[in-house]
């Protein structure tokens, strides 16, 4: 997956620190107070859709083949820059019942981005 | 995950049969000749981003909280209707060396869609 470096405008991973205090989640998340969750941004021109080797690759490659051949309904269906590899992270938080839980929460950190 | 029924225009899963002959892959895929791979389509208004209980939910919910509070750069970053649950399928195909391979290929079938 491509890293955003300010020079590219195609689908890439942008490093980003998520601060739980900024979104008011600090009243139920005990630790960490924030983390590098990152996000995906950038264009998905038709020639790169489904070519990332991402977890979506087989399906998105197939759909892209349909799109490239102008088959309805995919001709107008836009490919999207989305997380294709996410990583869990351990969190200490109050659950719905106000009990303190330490748990690995799935899909917290965006590791790679690709075109859907 | 929502199923597309022609009545909704928000993010949903559309049943779709992928025909390998149509995209010219029948010369290396022996079986099946096609399958229901489905795809995702529809709008992702801000209020449904990250509310699907999907595999993307933690990260997309966090990003949506930033987006709703108008924090740069998310205010203009669009949420996208993408596969959030995919299923493997068994395939019989010729590999690069023209050997016949039977293998479960990951992420072939879209099971659920959600907003990134």
């Amino acid at each position: 997956g491509l890293e955003c470096d300010g020079k590219v405008n195609i689908c890439c991973r942008q490093q980003f620190f998520i601060d739980f205090r900024l979104i008011g989640w600090n009243d139920w998340i005990i630790a960490p107070t924030g983390y590098y969750g990152n996000y995906c941004e950038g264009e998905c021109p038709s020639h790169i859709a489904g070519t990332s080797g991402s977890s979506l690759s087989f399906h998105s490659t197939v759909i892209n083949h349909y799109r490239m051949r102008g088959h309805s309904p995919f001709a107008n269906l836009k490919s999207c820059c989305v997380p294709t590899k996410l990583r869990p992270m351990s969190m200490l938080y109050y659950d719905d019942g106000q009990n303190i839980i330490k748990k690995d929460i799935q899909n917290m950190i965006v590791e790679e981005c690709g075109c859907s | 995950g929502l199923e597309c029924d022609g009545k909704v225009n928000i993010c949903c899963r559309q049943q779709f049969f992928i025909d390998f002959r149509l995209i010219g892959w029948n010369d290396w895929i022996i079986a099946p000749t096609g399958y229901y791979g489905n795809y995702c389509e529809g709008e992702c208004p801000s209020h449904i981003a990250g509310t699907s209980g999907s595999s993307l939910s933690f990260h997309s919910t966090v990003i949506n909280h930033y987006r709703m509070r108008g924090h740069s750069p998310f205010a203009n970053l669009k949420s996208c209707c993408v596969p959030t649950k995919l299923r493997p399928m068994s395939m019989l195909y010729y590999d690069d060396g023209q050997n016949i391979i039977k293998k479960d290929i990951q992420n072939m079938i879209v099971e659920e869609c959600g907003c990134s």
Epitope: I23, G24, D96 | P45, S46, H47, G53, T61
Partner: antibody, heavy 124, light 107 residues
Framework: QVQLVESGGGVVQPGRSLRLSCAAS????????MHWVRQAPGKGLEWVAV????????YHADSVKGRFTISRDNSKNTLYLQVNSLRAEDTAVYYC?????????????????WGQGTTVTVSS | DIQMTQSPSSLSASVGDRVTITCRAS??????LGWYQQKPGKAPKRLIY???SLQSGVPSRFSGSGSGTEFTLTISSLQPEDFTTYYC?????????FGQGTKVEIK
């Protein structure tokens, strides 16, 4: 500590309107979904309406749809319920309730903190 | 809409008894169910969340079980303060719906 305080109830004639308010304190109001639940005298609990943390999404029970409107002002930490075209069957204690707008592994967070309630009596 | 059928509507029991209250959902709600206790003139208080987890600060004599469509609240040994009304709530899909309530009375 976390507190929800309802106000605005009273005795009102059928067909008239009221605006119920709920002042929230002790937590980040703008991060939580908020609900109204009511209870008619001697009866059970009835869920009335919900509003998303940011006001972007609302659901109302069929029994109040078109007559009641839930809203919020995050800058004032206040939840509202505009009740119009009141009927005798709307007579109840109205509770303001909090829930976290969050789900994980297909578990959707429920109602955790309740206010003490405000009484609406519809009578001619 | 999901209907929640709670039974019994009332029951008589003695201090120290074990009591069970049932809620049945008209369709599957996974574990998106809570149990609430309401004392006269007071707001409801949650006892059980996620069908079987004990709310912080609630005595361990209360327990919940079930998933899908069948749920139970059990009080292992009734205490004098437990004689009141109990409700289940499904929060799987809108509109959220409560059971009709169960009044636990002294025999």
């Amino acid at each position: 500590q976390v507190q929800l305080v309802e106000s605005g109830g009273g005795v009102v004639q059928p067909g008239r309107s009221l605006r119920l308010s709920c002042a929230a304190s002790g937590f980040t109001f703008s991060s939580y979904g908020m609900h109204w639940v009511r209870q008619a005298p001697g009866k059970g609990l009835e869920w009335v309406a919900v509003i998303w943390y940011d006001g972007s999404n609302k659901y109302h029970a069929d029994s109040v749809k078109g007559r009641f409107t839930i809203s919020r002002d995050n800058s004032k930490n206040t939840l509202y319920l505009q009740v119009n075209s009141l009927r005798a069957e709307d007579t109840a204690v109205y509770y303001c309730v909090r829930s976290r707008n969050w789900n994980y592994d297909n578990y959707y967070y429920g109602l955790d903190v309740w206010g003490q309630g405000t009484t609406v009596t519809v009578s001619s | 809409d999901i209907q929640m059928t709670q039974s019994p509507s009332s029951l008589s029991a003695s201090v120290g008894d074990r009591v069970t209250i049932t809620c049945r959902a008209s369709q599957g709600i996974r574990n998106n169910l809570g149990w609430y206790q309401q004392k006269p003139g007071k707001a409801p208080k949650r006892l059980i969340y996620a069908a079987s987890s004990l709310q912080s600060g609630v005595p361990s004599r209360f327990s919940g079980s079930g998933s899908g469509t069948e749920f139970t609240l059990t009080i292992s040994s009734l205490q004098p303060e437990d004689f009141t009304t109990y409700y289940c709530l499904q929060h799987n899909s809108y509109p959220w719906t409560f059971g009709q309530g169960t009044k636990v009375e002294i025999k």
